[in-house]
């Protein structure tokens, strides 16, 4: 299953990055799982994941750094609290969980660049 | 003539970006001209240029946003005063001016990403 996502995104100076993950659904899925993976330093880690029912809101865990909304076959993902050390390739993985058959799609990744802001001068 | 430069550079939160431009000199040039070009929005513009004698300092014009140093066949370039709107592909062009023959080399470009900082809160 094909998954499309932008090649590059710049995090804002507040450490927030948003991108769209779009999948070409071969069937009429009602339950979809979206996982954001980060590949950097020869390591792949799970950033966040959410399972949602089509037409409903994406719900990430309360302590997740991700939020998102869905619209049809598009998922709008926002990752917050990013620091320069979080720069890396963020990969969107989409799984159509229900009804069968199960489908898996993995995007090519979005390179997110993060620059730490200069501290503001103390207000004396 | 081959010219190497990094594919991607992030400007600091102060709007400063530095990268190395390295050329494979086919001869013993004594006078070298380095030009930085910016390609964005289907347009190529000259950002800055400097001619230098091998072993001497690069001298850009006083009002130039570029500074640089040279060491052998390497030129260390710094561009300052960058804003988010200056994001683009910065291409290093190297010309061996003297002695003849003239050689020209153009790098593949360095994509410089610039993020505008959040303004600091007013100190009331």
């Amino acid at each position: 299953m094909h998954v499309a996502q932008p090649a590059v995104v710049l995090a804002s100076s507040r450490g927030i990055a948003s991108f769209v993950c779009e999948y070409a659904s071969p069937g009429k899925a009602t339950e979809v799982r979206v996982t954001v993976l980060r590949q950097a330093d020869s390591q792949v880690t799970e950033v966040c994941a959410a399972t949602y029912m089509m037409g409903n809101e994406l719900t990430f865990l309360d302590d997740s750094i991700c939020t998102g909304t869905s619209s049809g076959n598009q998922v709008n993902l926002t990752i917050q609290g990013l620091r320069a050390m979080d720069t890396g390739l963020y990969i969107c993985k989409v799984e159509l969980m229900y009804p069968p058959p199960y489908y898996l799609g993995i995007g090519n990744g979005t390179q997110i660049y993060v620059i730490d802001p200069e501290p503001c001068p103390d207000s004396d | 003539m081959h010219v190497a430069q990094p594919a991607v550079v992030l400007a600091s939160s102060r709007g400063i970006a530095s990268f190395v431009c390295e050329y494979a000199s086919p001869g013993k040039a004594t006078e070298v001209r380095v030009t930085v070009l910016r390609q964005a929005d289907s347009q190529v513009t000259e950002v800055c240029a400097a001619t230098y004698m091998m072993g001497n300092e690069l001298t850009f014009l006083d009002d130039s946003i570029c500074t640089g140093t040279s060491s052998g066949n390497q030129v260390n370039l710094t561009i300052q005063g960058l804003r988010a709107m200056d994001t683009g592909l910065y291409i290093c062009k190297v010309e061996l001016m003297y002695p003849p023959p003239y050689y020209l080399g153009i790098g593949n470009g360095t994509q410089i990403y610039v993020i505008d900082p959040e303004p600091c809160p007013d100190s009331d």
């Epitope: 996982t35 993976l37 590949q39 020869s42 390591q43 792949v44 880690t45 799970e46 990969i91 993985k93 799984e95 199960y102 898996l104 993995i106 090519n108 990744g109 | -």
Partner: nanobody, 129 residues
Framework: QVQLQESGGGSVQAGGSLRLSCAAS????????MAWFRQAPGKEREGVAT????????AYADSVKGRFTISQDNAKNTVYLQMNSLKPEDTAMYYC??????????????????????WGQGTQVTVSS
């Protein structure tokens, strides 16, 4: 429904050999990335070997280089893992996984299993000293 079925596991003495097979149905193994992973009790699933480009490109984890060989029979839509000079530390459940060719080389990274799916049920390999 895509299905991957592993076979060939078993018990063997250290220094012995085994050949694992992974038969893919409703999935074209030759045009995708196929990988062998293993998981020991209480440990994360780790990539052992990958194959893609119809068998033209392979990659191995450092721990198995020179001992394990991954291969593919495109006509049978099957991927094999020939395991020689087995060691007790090779004891694990071995899984076949399928994924995107874009990330085939990432399979042997720490956490590389996240980039794969369509897992088989696994086949147990036990190596005794």
């Amino acid at each position: 429904q895509v299905q991957l079925q592993e076979s060939g596991g078993g018990s063997v003495q250290a220094g012995g050999s085994l050949r694992l097979s992974c038969a893919a149905s409703r999935y074209t193994a030759s045009s995708n990335c196929m990988a062998w992973f293993r998981q020991a009790p209480g440990k994360e699933r780790e990539g052992v070997a990958t194959i893609y480009n119809g068998g033209g490109s392979t990659a191995y984890a450092d721990s198995v280089k020179g001992r394990f060989t991954i291969s593919q029979d495109n006509a049978k839509n099957t991927v094999y893992l020939q395991m020689n000079s087995l060691k007790p530390e090779d004891t694990a459940m071995y899984y076949c996984g399928a994924g995107s060719p874009r990330f085939c080389a990432s399979a042997t990274m720490t956490g590389g299993h996240h980039l794969f799916g369509y897992w088989g049920q696994g086949t147990q390999v036990t190596v005794s000293s």
